[in-house]
Amino acid sequence: PEPPTACREKQYLINSQCCSLCQPGQKLVSDCTEFTETECLPCGESEFLDTWNRETHCHQHKYCDPNLGLRVQQKGTSETDTICTCEEGWHCTSEACESCVLHRSCSPGFGVKQIATGVSDTICEPCPVGFFSNVSSAFEKCHPWTSCETKDLVVQQAGTNKTDVVCGPQDRLRA
């Protein structure tokens, strides 16, 4: 018979032959032959593989480094990685939670809608028209543009979401 060009799900093609992939939690020791099945071995302690695979090495479990404020949220198994979270009151910097911050700052152009708590991180909101923020802050709201009119001045430069308006003297018409 013709050698296969494609294999079924949970199989892989090698040496013109379809071999079974190793199940999650196991790594490949040797490919199958005409006479033998694929040989797989369980991952060691602190290792995992989370898919049907033909990997010859298992992945190391993630280390939740206490020096970065991390602790184990869920211990890894032979089929799953360790899940880290931050110490109480601290917040993950990303979905992968590789480091912790006390809270995030809102960038210029954004103001703080809600200051961080032990449970939730800073909530930012864009400064609407008429308001601005020119700093990165974890507590400052958007500030209203200066009202030039109340100072008997005129707008010389329009404000943006990141800058205040610039006021200047009114042009005096000469007689």
Epitope: N67, L68, G69, C86, E87, W90, S99, C100, V101, L102, H103, R104, S105, V135, S136, S137, A138, F139, E140
Partner: nanobody, 116 residues
Framework: EVQLLESGGGLVQPGGSLRLSCAAS????????LWWVRQAPGKGLERVSA????????YYADSVKGRFTISRDDSKNTLYLQMNSLRAEDTAVYYC?????????RGQGTLVTVSS
Amino acid sequence: EVQLLESGGGLVQPGGSLRLSCAASGFTFAGYELWWVRQAPGKGLERVSAISGSGGSTYYADSVKGRFTISRDDSKNTLYLQMNSLRAEDTAVYYCAKDPYSFDYRGQGTLVTVSS
């Protein structure tokens, strides 16, 4: 290397006062927003007070409003927290923190104990 060193804590009676300091080194202090946070025994972190990079804006948690005052001296690279009318519930380790507020930037803290 960024370093924050808190000092000024101690044992004080209810109604008393303390002034905490946070000496910074390893970065240009001026222009950075700075925070005081605290952790009471067996409790989570509480954000106490903050001061803007310019010193023109401040924030106080409701629990300390009217009793605590935050200030900064950029020439001395030092942040302060003046604490008056202290209460038993102010007992905690107090830390200062700077943007970007990484866990590894925090200082060792200074313990404030309010007890008679």
